[in-house]
């Protein structure tokens, strides 16, 4: 996702997972200076902010995802022990200091472990 100010790359736009897995929502970005990174979650039930931070500083994690998410300075986040309700769309926005922004999306499908799958 090229831009004059910010570039954003999402290596895997769709992720399939099973419940209780830890999932990495992986991205790479480049820009001038230190950007602000924001992840939001969107589903049929609405949209909510997950986390916002500037790499190198403390992340502001929403109450709904406290102790369930971990941030990385490359913009990626990890979701711990996902459930079916974590299925949905994850939108990352990278905004550089001068205001130039880029966004990208990742689709997460989380399914139950079926008994037949274990045999």
């Amino acid at each position: 996702l090229q831009s004059q100010g910010v570039s954003l790359y999402i290596p895997q736009a769709t992720i399939n997972a099973t419940v209780k897995e830890d999932i990495l929502l992986s991205v790479e970005y480049s820009c001038h200076g230190v950007p602000t990174i924001e992840w939001t979650y969107s589903s049929n039930w609405g949209t909510q902010k997950i986390v916002e931070w500037k790499p190198g500083t403390q992340a502001n994690i929403s109450q709904s995802h406290k102790d369930r998410v971990c941030t990385f300075d490359n913009g990626s986040i990890q979701l711990f022990s996902v459930g079916v309700r974590d299925s949905g769309y994850y939108v990352i926005t990278v905004t550089e200091r001068l205001g130039s922004s880029q966004f990208g999306t990742i689709v997460l499908h989380v399914s139950e472990i079926l008994y037949e799958d274990l045999h």
């Epitope: 996702l1 954003l8 999402i10 736009a13 769709t14 922004s101 966004f103 990208g104 999306t105 689709v107």
Partner: antibody, heavy 121, light 108 residues
Framework: EVQLVESGGGLVQPGGSLRLSCAAS????????MTWVRQAPGKGLEWVSV????????YYADSVKGRFTISRDNSKNTLYLQMSSLRAEDTAVYYC??????????????WGQGTLVTVSS | EIVLTQSPGTLSLSPGERATLSCRAS???????LAWYQQKPGQAPRLLIY???SRATGIPDRFSGSASGTDFTLTITRLEPEDFAVYFC?????????FGGGTKVEIK
């Protein structure tokens, strides 16, 4: 009834500036992202810029970045596009459109009738 | 950026016939994030389909959208006289937002 009315278009010389406005009514303006999309004569649609409902997040097409600025005044229910360093290739009908929500997803369910910008000497 | 390629450029059909319009994305990741618009001469675009296959408010059920991988399809099952227009696809999976070049559906 949702209504979007663009104004401010006209003839401008290359290198000149222009400010487009889009007056909105019939919905809670601050709750929706807004966009500008342009269409050169006889051509297809080209996205220009989008702004979130609160105005805090903006995105631009590379072709206008650094020259155009999108903004909004939620107290006046009005969207703006400040255009500078205009070029002949900016000649188009400029549409404003309402987003589905305050931010992503960025698709657009209501459109104005457009205002024509002509850049020529 | 994601490039959307629409085909054919022009579709010549008669009222009552079925129209199949294609929109191909240059990369995966568009998945469910595609909209279709209709535009008639001298008018603004009108949203038909969002999220690949959901009809917008007031859109008749002869319009439907589907996808397979990076290929997206708008189908009009029985063309009505008012359906002859230009159709554009648009992706909102990533910035910059992009539109396809359009398909003109004209009367044969």
């Amino acid at each position: 009834e949702v209504q979007l009315v663009e104004s401010g278009g006209g003839l401008v010389q290359p290198g000149g500036s222009l400010r487009l406005s889009c007056a909105a009514s019939g919905f809670t303006f601050s709750s929706y992202a807004m966009t500008w999309v342009r269409q050169a004569p006889g051509k297809g649609l080209e996205w220009v810029s989008v702004i979130s409902g609160g105005g805090g997040t903006t995105y631009y097409a590379d072709s206008v970045k650094g020259r155009f600025t999108i903004s909004r005044d939620n107290s006046k229910n009005t969207l703006y596009l400040q255009m500078s360093s205009l070029r002949a290739e900016d000649t188009a009908v400029y549409y404003c459109a309402k987003g589905y929500s305050s931010g992503w997803p960025y698709y657009f369910d209501y459109w104005g009738q457009g205002t024509l910008v002509t850049v020529s000497s | 950026e994601i490039v959307l390629t629409q085909s054919p450029g022009t579709l010549s059909l008669s009222p009552g016939e079925r129209a199949t319009l294609s929109c191909r994305a240059s990369q995966s990741g568009v998945t469910n994030f595609l909209a279709w618009y209709q535009q008639k001469p001298g008018q603004a675009p009108r949203l038909l389909i969002y999220a690949t296959s959901s009809r917008a408010t007031g859109i008749p059920d002869r319009f439907s959208g589907s996808a397979s991988g990076t290929d997206f399809t708008l189908t009009i099952t029985r063309l009505e006289p008012e359906d002859f227009a230009v159709y554009f696809c648009q992706q909102y999976a990533s910035s910059p937002l992009t539109f396809g070049g359009g398909t003109k559906v004209e009367i044969k």
